[in-house]
């Protein structure tokens, strides 16, 4: 199935559409603004999913969606907002967000294969971040504060969570 | 609306290197979308060539893979197509292609290439 | 890469009657609930262009009498009613993955 119907030429109605499309694929011939990690098709006079597209690299709307996307397909790796960069966990293990908490929790299991300042980390020996939280998971009970990420920038509980939230 | 043209040297012999570029007027190809060569040989067969995203990033046919190369120059709103050690195989009429979404909505009209001693 | 395969090389349909295409992929063309099968007529000293975009969907300015139905591995282009101006190589396209391939092409005429 095509996932789609005839397009405004082609003489679906908008009910139609949206039958067709309860998440709001449609957005009606007018509109070209489209819900987040969507974009507009021209072709088509809908808002798409921006999954559909990162293969082909189209449209400038999805860049950071199908960045995003294809850090999260990497192991050991998560996708920072604000920084818009693929961060790979082994270099912020101890002070992760939940996103690393996987292959962090596990790196730290083994303590063979972890840097010598981790190790130290574990041992006690840093004192700043040995509530074992982390400086990332932390973050959203400690209200505004800088963020780990972008030392000189604060952030809201409420910004931190939107930032670090997949 | 957005127009795109080819323009080639038309004749090249086996062996040697060539660049094929496409002017792109109406729209930059800084600002969003997909730019893409594609090629029809004699007997109408049509093959994807590669393509030069917006951002500036490639992605070429794996079955051309090392012996080309999309760049642009984003002053002149060109993108270029370079094919090396070329063999009368190559031989083909080429055309640039905008995808927009995941389809080729405007194209060229086509610069023939005849590889030939 | 997704092999297209094209049927039949060559039609002849009267006017007035209908023309069907088909295009049989190697592999699925569906993701996201899409079909990524797009079909272009060229005529000839022109490039192609867009007919049918993601399966059944017409592309600008593309007359009703073309319409196209399919998904996962198998599409058709429907002509109807056969025109003239009809007259045309018909190329299948899929976009779900990089490389995009194309189908041989059909070659239409009137009877």
């Known amino acids: 199935m095509s996932g789609l119907g005839r397009s405004r030429r082609g003489g679906r109605s908008r009910v139609d559409q949206e039958e067709r499309f309860p998440q709001g694929l449609w957005t009606g011939v007018a509109m070209r603004s489209c819900p987040e990690e969507q974009y507009w098709d021209p072709l088509l006079g809908t808002c798409m999913s921006c999954k559909t597209i990162c293969n082909h690299q189209s449209q400038r709307t999805c860049a950071a969606f199908c960045r995003s996307l294809s850090c999260r397909k990497e192991q050991g790796k998560f996708y920072d907002h604000l920084l818009r960069d693929c961060i790979s966990c082994a270099s912020i293990c101890g002070q992760h967000p939940k996103q690393c908490a996987y292959f962090c929790e596990n790196k730290l299991r083994s303590p063979v294969n972890l840097p010598p300042e981790l190790r130290r980390q574990r041992s006690g020996e840093v004192e700043n971040n040995s509530d074992n939280s982390g400086r990332y998971q932390g973050l959203e009970h400690r209200g505004s504060e800088a963020s780990p990420a972008l030392p000189g920038l604060k952030l809201s509980a409420d910004q931190v969570a939107l930032v670090y939230s997949t | 609306d957005v127009q795109l043209q080819e323009s080639g040297p038309g004749l090249v012999k086996p062996s040697q290197s060539l660049s094929l570029t496409c002017t792109v007027s109406?729209?930059?190809?800084?600002?969003?979308?997909?730019w893409h060569w594609i090629r029809q040989f004699p007997g109408n067969k049509l093959e994807w060539v590669g393509y030069i995203s917006y951002s500036g990033s490639t992605r070429y046919n794996p079955s051309l893979n090392s012996r080309i190369s999309i760049t642009r120059d984003t002053s002149k709103n060109q993108f270029f197509l370079q094919l090396k050690s070329v063999t009368t195989e190559d031989t083909a009429t080429y055309f640039c292609a905008r995808v927009v979404s995941t389809s080729f909505d405007s194209w060229g009209l086509g610069t023939t290439l005849t590889v030939s001693s | 890469g997704i092999v297209l395969t094209q049927s039949p090389p060559s039609l002849a349909v009267s006017l007035g009657q209908r023309a069907t295409i088909s295009c049989r992929a190697s592999?699925?063309?569906?993701?996201?609930?899409?079909?990524?099968m797009n079909w272009f007529q060229q005529k000839p000293g022109q490039p192609p262009k867009l007919l049918i975009y993601v399966a059944s969907n017409q592309g600008s300015g593309v007359p009703a009498r073309f319409s196209g139905s399919g998904s996962g591995t198998d599409f058709s282009l429907n002509i109807h009613p056969m025109e003239e101006d009809d007259t045309a190589m018909y190329f299948c396209q899929q976009s779900k993955e990089v490389p995009y391939t194309f189908g041989g092409g059909t070659k239409l005429e009137i009877k």
């Open positions: 592999e699925s063309v569906d993701n996201y609930g899409i079909s990524f």
């Open positions: 109406g729209f930059s190809i800084t600002s969003d979308y997909a």
